[in-house]
Amino acid sequence: LQEKIEEIAAKYKHLVVKKCCYDGVRINHDETCEQRAARISVGPRCVKAFTECCVVASQLRANNSHKDLQLGR
C-alpha cells in the first residue's frame, strides 16, 4: 500500500496537492472517498489527488482483506 501511494504521490510536485493525496489514504470507515472529498475547499487539484489516493488505498485494503479471508486468517 505504502509503495503504491508513494508512487502516485511522487507525481504531485505541489506540496499541498501531495499532502491532499496522503490525506486520502487515512482510514475512515464511516464515509466514502467521494463524501470526504466533497468537503475539500482548497481546489479541484486537491480533490483529484485526494480521490485518486483514497480510491487506490481503499481498493488495496479491500484486496488484502479478501486475500486474508481466502487464507482463513
Epitope: 507525481k11 510536485k13 505541489h14 506540496l15 499541498v16 496537492v17 499532502k19 475547499s41 482548497v42 481546489g43 479541484p44 487539484r45 486537491c46
Partner: antibody, heavy 118, light 111 residues
Framework: QVQLVQSGAEVKKPGSSVKVSCKAS????????IHWMRQAPGQGLEWMGY????????NYNENFKGRVTITADKSTSTAYMELSSLRSEDTAVYYC???????????WGQGTTVTVSS | DIVLTQSPASLAVSPGQRATITCKAS??????????MNWYQQKPGQPPKLLIY???NLDSGVPARFSGSGSGTDFTLTINPVEAEDTANYYC?????????FGGGTKVEIK
C-alpha cells in the same frame, strides 16, 4: 469583497529580523493558501513560500536557507512572514497573495516596503 | 526548479498594434492535461494583477484584447490592439510545482 491588507513599511538594521502581516477579509481564510513574494527595487518577482492556514502546511524557497518563517493566525485571519538575519539585499517590497484553486494568485496585498540599512 | 525565460525584456509598441510576449519554461508545466501557466500585469507602485490563468483564461474584468496561448514549455501573451494604459511590466508564472517561479518580466512601453 476579498482584501489582503499588509502592515506598514519597516526600516531595519542588518542582522535583525522583520515580521510582516497580511490580514485577509471577504472570504474564508482557511480555504486558500497564502503565498509571500518579494520584489527588490527595479527587479522581478521572487517567490518566498506559502502556508495553507487550515492545516498549517508550509513550504519555502530554499534560496532563503531557513531565514524565512510563515505562520497564520486563524482567529484573526492573518498570515505572517518573518525574515531573519537581514542584509542589505533584502531591501524590497514584500507581497502576500492568495492562491486560488492551487493554480494562480487572484488577490494581492498592497505590498510592504522593507528597507535594510545600517 | 522550473526556470521561466521571458522575451523580449522590453518592447515598444504603437497604439493599435500587436504586442507579443513569450515565456519559455525549462520543463513542461502541463500536468494530466492541464496547463499551469499564468500571466500578470504590474504597473509602477502597484502589486501585480492577474490577467490570464491556466494559459488562456481571462480573469474577470480583463479586456478581451489580452489573450494567452501555448502548451508544454512555450507560452505567449498577446495584447491586440495595444492601448496607452497597457504600459506596464508583464510576468509569466508557473504553479505546476513548488517552488512557484516567475519569469524575469517584460517591460511594455507605448510609443
Amino acid at each position: 469583497q476579498v482584501q489582503l491588507v499588509q502592515s506598514g513599511a519597516e526600516v531595519k538594521k542588518p542582522g535583525s529580523s522583520v515580521k510582516v502581516s497580511c490580514k485577509a477579509s471577504g472570504y474564508t481564510f482557511t480555504d486558500h493558501i497564502i503565498h509571500w513574494m518579494r520584489q527588490a527595487p527595479g527587479q522581478g518577482l521572487e517567490w518566498m513560500g506559502y502556508i495553507y492556514p487550515r492545516e498549517g502546511w508550509t513550504n519555502y524557497n530554499e534560496n532563503f536557507k531557513g531565514r524565512v518563517t510563515i505562520t497564520a493566525d486563524k482567529s484573526t485571519s492573518t498570515a505572517y512572514m518573518e525574515l531573519s538575519s537581514l542584509r542589505s539585499e533584502d531591501t524590497a517590497v514584500y507581497y502576500c497573495a492568495r492562491e486560488r484553486n492551487l493554480e494562480y494568485f487572484d488577490y494581492w496585498g498592497q505590498g510592504t516596503t522593507v528597507t535594510v540599512s545600517s | 526548479d522550473i526556470v521561466l525565460t521571458q522575451s523580449p525584456a522590453s518592447l515598444a509598441v504603437s497604439p493599435g498594434q500587436r504586442a507579443t510576449i513569450t515565456c519559455k519554461a525549462s520543463q513542461s508545466v502541463d500536468f494530466e492535461g492541464d496547463n499551469y501557466m499564468n500571466w500578470y500585469q504590474q504597473k509602477p507602485g502597484q502589486p501585480p494583477k492577474l490577467l490570464i490563468y491556466a494559459t488562456s483564461n481571462l480573469d474577470s474584468g480583463v479586456p478581451a484584447r489580452f489573450s494567452g496561448s501555448g502548451s508544454g514549455t512555450d507560452f505567449t501573451l498577446t495584447i491586440n490592439p495595444v492601448e496607452a494604459e497597457d504600459t506596464a511590466n508583464y510576468y509569466c508564472q508557473q504553479s505546476v510545482e513548488d517552488p512557484h517561479t516567475f519569469g524575469g518580466g517584460t517591460k511594455v512601453e507605448i510609443k
